[in-house]
């Protein structure tokens, strides 16, 4: 057998088993698992006298290694004294020594609970530059404890952590905080908080969760857009699965219909996101009539690391219907931007919230990328509203100064569309917007209100107006805010819109 250094263990009695009037007491030290012979055991008894006896070594049958016990008997004021057993094993090394310091007896104690907590990620699921690990050592009988942090089983520098102890009633708690750089945390190492107490070791370990554990995988199922449903007459629905860990098993998306009828062939797309997660979309064509008649479609998401399948279903929105009101406006010319103009379209008081917005010029639909449309928001009443914004160039309005904002919505009649035309220069083009004069006062609609009155002339505040409180001397509904134009103007001029 090769040379093996001993493991050393203190041998003590339970304090409650020692009579209070005992004048002497015996304690011991076990050295085990060493090879070859011998070990030398010496005792430090402090100020007390003691007699020692080392028992002959015995052979451990399985390994052929040795074990021996040394006993120390002390008399006098032993209860307050600490004793050190020093074991030397020269075959391991000329200076191989293991010291164990302990008292005569062990008291009953409540062991600690050890738990590591970790600081949060930011809102986007990303780790901050430093990560804090908090080791909570709680509920133990007060006494000396030693906390060591390990990285993959190797001792970490004590100066990287801070510790504090509190006592509540008869029990104590200690917490140790370790600060790590993001680089170390992300390197997939295991961090252990190791607590030594009353000769026992307690620990808890943690590491960055493996990417194979889906971080809150979510699934969403969209309804067909009104444009696809009523204009193109080729509606599709999309099942979107986000926050998947890449390349860790296949995600399956399965379509079905509540009626049990067969579904069409779907198309699938996978996209790696910048945060390292995978997004999977499956698009299913549905029948226009099936959808309008209220068929329910289901998307079932399965993945090896999901505890159970995710089910999402969609169907035509129920509830009251209301057609949209459409208002289109052109903003006045802005100094330095003579060759560009912004058109705005307020579409409001429609139900349900599904709506498609298009802009047309010269009877041709402009690409969706040309305009920006908000998500439907609830009005103060029961309907919804959206704003759509389109930038047009001088070349376009000089070719034909009429732009159309069209809303596609199931409640609009006769053909599920409502549209309004707007001109950049209404005076020249004879359009329906107001004539352009320098304003001295502007009326703005507060963004929190239900919507604009039907007679409103616009929805975008004059670029140089600022919002004031509603004024009693100004005509209009009380919920409208007043904006005062800073530049001088010759005649009163009103503009109603969002501040």
């Amino acid at each position: 057998a090769s040379t093996q250094s001993p493991s050393v263990f203190p041998l003590t009695r339970c304090c409650k088993n020692i009579p209070s009037n005992a004048t002497s007491v015996t304690l011991g030290c076990l050295a085990t698992g060493y090879f070859p012979e011998p070990v030398m055991v010496t005792w430090d008894t402090g100020s007390l006298n003691g007699t020692t006896m080392t028992l002959p070594a015995t052979t451990l049958t399985l390994s052929g290694h040795y074990a021996t016990i040394s006993l120390l008997t002390v008399s006098g004021a032993w209860a307050k004294q600490m004793f050190t057993c020093r074991v030397a094993h020269t075959p391991s090394s000329t200076d191989w020594v293991d010291n164990k310091t302990f008292s005569v007896c062990s008291r009953d104690f409540t062991p600690p609970t050890v738990k590591i907590l970790q600081s949060s990620c930011d809102g986007g699921g990303h780790f901050p530059p430093t990560i804090q690990l908090l080791c909570l050592v709680s509920g133990y009988t007060p006494g000396t404890i030693n906390i060591t942090w390990l990285e993959d089983g190797q001792v970490m520098d004590v100066d990287l952590s801070t510790a504090s102890t509190t006592q509540e009633g008869e029990l104590a708690s200690t917490q140790s905080e370790l600060t790590l750089s993001q680089k170390h945390w992300l390197s997939d190492r295991t961090y252990t908080c190791q607590v030594t107490y009353q000769g026992h070791t307690f620990e808890d370990s943690t590491k960055k969760c493996a990417d194979s554990n889906p971080r809150g995988v979510s699934a969403y199922l969209s309804r067909p857009s009104p444009f696809d449903l009523f204009i193109r007459k080729s509606p599709t629905i999309t099942c979107l699965v986000v926050d998947l860990a890449p390349s860790k098993g296949t995600v399956n998306l399965t379509w079905s219909r509540a009626s049990g009828k067969p579904v069409n062939h779907s198309t699938r797309k996978e996209e790696k996101q910048r945060n390292g997660t995978l997004t999977v979309t499956s698009t299913l064509p549905v029948g226009t009539r099936d959808w309008i008649e209220g068929e329910t479609y289901q998307c079932r998401v399965t993945h090896p690391h999901l505890p159970r399948a995710l089910m999402r279903s969609t169907t035509k929105t129920s509830g009251p219907r209301a057609a949209p009101e459409v208002y289109a406006f052109a903003t006045p010319e802005w100094p330095g931007s003579r060759d560009k103009r912004t058109l705005a379209c307020l579409i409001q008081n429609f139900m349900p919230e599904d709506i498609s917005v298009q802009w047309l010029h010269n009877e041709v639909q402009l690409p969706d990328a040309r305009h920006s449309t908000t998500q439907p928001r609830k009005t103060k009443g029961s309907g919804f509203f959206v704003f759509s914004r389109l930038e047009v160039t001088r070349a376009e309005w000089e070719q034909k100064d009429e732009f159309i904002c069209r809303a596609v919505h199931e409640a609009a009649s006769p053909s599920q569309t409502v549209q309004r035309a707007v001109s950049v220069n209404p005076g020249l083009a004879g359009g329906s917007a107001q004539s352009q004069r320098a304003p001295d006062r502007v009326l703005c609609h507060s963004g929190q209100q239900q919507g604009l009155p039907r007679a409103a002339g616009g929805s975008v505040p004059h670029p140089r107006c600022h919002c004031g409180a509603g004024r009693a001397d100004w005509p209009g509904p009380p919920e409208l805010d007043v904006c005062v134009e800073e530049a001088e103007g010759e005649a009163p001029w009103t503009w109603t819109g969002l501040c």
Partner: antibody, heavy 119, light 107 residues
Framework: QVKLQESGPELKKPGETVKISCKAS????????MNWVKQAPGKGLKWMGW????????TYAEEFKGRFAFSLETSASTAYLQINNLKNEDTATYFC????????????WGQGTTVTVSS | DIELTQSPATLSVTPGDRVSLSCRAS??????LHWYQQKSHESPRLLIK???QSISGIPSRFSGSGSGSDFTLSINSVEPEDVGVYYC?????????FGAGTKLEIK
């Protein structure tokens, strides 16, 4: 007290193999990583790599991948550095150094083993 | 790899002098820089860790400062036994690298 005791000097020929030992005492061997550092005659210190004494996993600097191998004999609290196919440029003093994780603090060093490679 | 540039290469001082040894990193390494002393025919000895944290058993005349990429080891009042080579070491980025050293001599 913590002590790292390295084996004695070695004189080798090119192409031979050398195995240096580093025996640790005064602490729990498997709790601390062990680094190996090379110092060529009259030169500075060059980190070769380290071995996790708990898992046995070795990490090498780019320059020391291939002919160099770290190993352990945990029962004897000893770490080893083996250099195969020795070259003249391996002539140096090799130090073992105990490490505090995770920022490579080398708090205790062995006395060094001088390896001379000469034909 | 991060390069550490130490200056001066050699420093000749009189006992009692206050000296400063510089170490510059090729990129920021926060405070993860350690200093070692190596006397002739001896192994290196840890003097300072994390740029400024003192080590038990090291005389108080040794101190460190700096963060980012510029670091300084100061010896308040040089003693004759301080002769040797002083190395800085990057502990921040893999692999750990050492500076070429500053040799301290006594006039």
């Amino acid at each position: 007290q913590v002590k790292l005791q390295e084996s004695g000097p070695e004189l080798k020929k090119p192409g031979e193999t050398v195995k240096i030992s580093c025996k640790a005492s005064g602490y729990t061997f498997t709790n601390y990583g062990m680094n190996w550092v090379k110092q060529a005659p009259g030169k500075g210190l060059k980190w070769m790599g380290w071995i996790n004494t708990n898992t046995g996993e070795s990490t090498y600097a780019e320059e020391f991948k291939g002919r160099f191998a770290f190993s352990l004999e945990t029962s004897a609290s000893t770490a080893y550095l083996q250099i195969n196919n020795l070259k003249n440029e391996d002539t140096a003093t090799y130090f073992c150094a105990r490490e505090l994780r995770p920022y490579h603090v080398m708090d205790y060093w062995g006395q060094g083993t001088t390896v001379t490679v000469s034909s | 790899d991060i390069e550490l540039t130490q200056s001066p290469a050699t420093l000749s001082v009189t006992p009692g002098d206050r000296v400063s040894l510089s170490c510059r990193a090729s990129q920021s390494i926060s405070v993860y820089l350690h200093w070692y002393q190596q006397k002739s025919h001896e192994s290196p000895r840890l003097l300072i860790k994390y740029a400024s944290q003192s080590i038990s058993g090291i005389p108080s005349r040794f101190s460190g400062s700096g963060s980012g990429s510029d670091f300084t080891l100061s010896i308040n009042s040089v003693e004759p036994e301080d002769v040797g080579v002083y190395y800085c070491q990057n502990g921040h980025s893999f692999p750990p690298t050492f500076g070429a050293g500053t040799k301290l001599e006594i006039k």
